[in-house]
Interface confidence: medium
Amino acid sequence: SGTTNTVAAYNLTWKSTNFKTILEWEPKPVNQVYTVQISTKSGDWKSKCFYTTDTECDLTDEIVKDVKQTYLARVFSVPWRNSTHGKETLFGTHGEEPPFTNARKFLPYRDTKLGQPTIQSFEQVGTKVNVTVEDERTLVRRNNTFLSLRDVFGKDLIYTLYYWKSSSSGKKTAKTNTNEFLIDVDKGENYCFSVQAVIPSRTVNRKSTDSPVECMGQEKGEFRE
């Protein structure tokens, strides 16, 4: 049969951050190519990354259509043949279905990782500092505009702020379910800040990595008496 020499894909892995979503798998192809299919639980299969020699497929355009849907994906291993007319169907020249491997179910809203946040600015007024976290743009669209992380997650998303005096290592924390913190600081002291995005309602992928550290006395800050 035409598929006897193909190797089924394995180690299928979803890599997704802020809804940018790529399906990866092994092995590197030898005498075969891959085609990926994706569907919702109730929908039809849609083919992507036709006859690719890559071992990854960007499925972002599909999953952002509804990030609260559950998606199924599978990778077909297709024999590499040069046919006389230069075209192949997914099911080979003899109509048999090539071997495929299913990926685990993927629910973008639950499974996408939170990207590393960025501190947009901080402003000191007397003994208070307002720290603002940048609202990261996602690839989820609404009316042809890209939505931010807050647009998509709303109250599900909180931020944790870690802050400490430049002169010491003792960290304090604050939390917000907006993108802003207002914290008390000691006058005349410089502070450093780092933030982390958190979705408390999740059981996995709850936290992002910490943002780069920003310290008072650097460009991002502003000081007013």
Partner: antibody, heavy 120, light 113 residues
Framework: EVQLVQSGAEVKKPGESLRISCKGS????????IEWVRQMPGKGLEWMGD????????TYSPSFQGHVTISADKSISTAYLQWSSLKASDTAMYYC?????????????WGQGTLVTVSS | DIVMTQTPLSLPVTPGEPASISCKSS????????????LTWYLQKPGQSPQLLIY???TRESGVPDRFSGSGSGTDFTLKISRVEAEDVGVYYC?????????FGQGTKLEIK
């Protein structure tokens, strides 16, 4: 079509326990918050708390924390609001609602309400 | 908690005339991250469950007639009905959808003169 169907009216005595339900259909139940809202006779709307059925994560209004319990069974697409010991002041219409698709975009779908009457 | 204050509490209107309801919040509902105001408007018609009209202060929910519009930013918001119809009677509520606990205004009762 998205629908939230609530259990029927209840008449209870003070001190009794009660659980009312809200069954969702026409959408994937797990990733949408279910909100509970109280409306006392002739009064306005009061937000009580919410639950994300996929994980059972809840948030309560401080005004209701400790007096009610919100839970959900995602396998049957149903959320619950329960009291262990009712008071006369719990007499009200209770609505469940589903959050909108986008973050913090309001309560897009509402149940028909469950009237709870607590009287000795 | 964020306190939501609506005015007026009662609004008699002649059909075909415009109507305006004000809602003020005790804290800003503007997210500096994405410049969205998390203010929501609902209408509860007599004997019915509330229905969503406007979210993000100015985004009309699908199916809501375009005679309804929302505006405002920060702490001051307005719901306008360009031409009131008989079916618009009921109680209008604004809601803080920005931060927990979510809070409603006390309601504005619109009635036909």
């Amino acid at each position: 079509e998205v629908q939230l169907v609530q259990s029927g009216a209840e008449v209870k005595k003070p001190g009794e326990s009660l659980r009312i339900s809200c069954k969702g259909s026409g959408y994937t139940f797990a990733p949408y918050w279910i909100e509970w809202v109280r409306q006392m006779p002739g009064k306005g709307l009061e937000w009580m708390g919410d639950i994300l059925p996929g994980t059972g994560f809840t948030t309560y209004s401080p005004s209701f924390q400790g007096h009610v319990t919100i839970s959900a069974d995602k396998s049957i697409s149903t959320a619950y609001l329960q009291w262990s010991s009712l008071k006369a002041s719990d007499t009200a219409m209770y609505y469940c609602a589903r959050s909108g698709y986008y973050g913090n975009s309001g309560f897009a779908y509402w149940g028909q309400g469950t009237l709870v009457t607590v009287s000795s | 908690d964020i306190v939501m204050t609506q005015t007026p509490l009662s609004l008699p209107v002649t059909p075909g005339e415009p109507a305006s309801i004000s809602c003020k919040s005790s804290q800003s509902l503007l997210s500096s991250g994405n410049q969205k105001n998390y203010l929501t408007w609902y209408l509860q018609k007599p004997g019915q469950s509330p229905q969503l009209l406007i979210y993000w202060a100015s985004t009309r929910e699908s199916g809501v007639p375009d005679r309804f519009s929302g505006s405002g930013s920060g702490t001051d918001f307005t719901l306008k009905i360009s031409r009131v119809e008989a079916e618009d009677v009921g109680v209008y509520y604004c809601q803080n959808d920005y931060t927990y606990p979510l809070t409603f205004g006390q309601g504005t009762k619109l009635e036909i003169k």
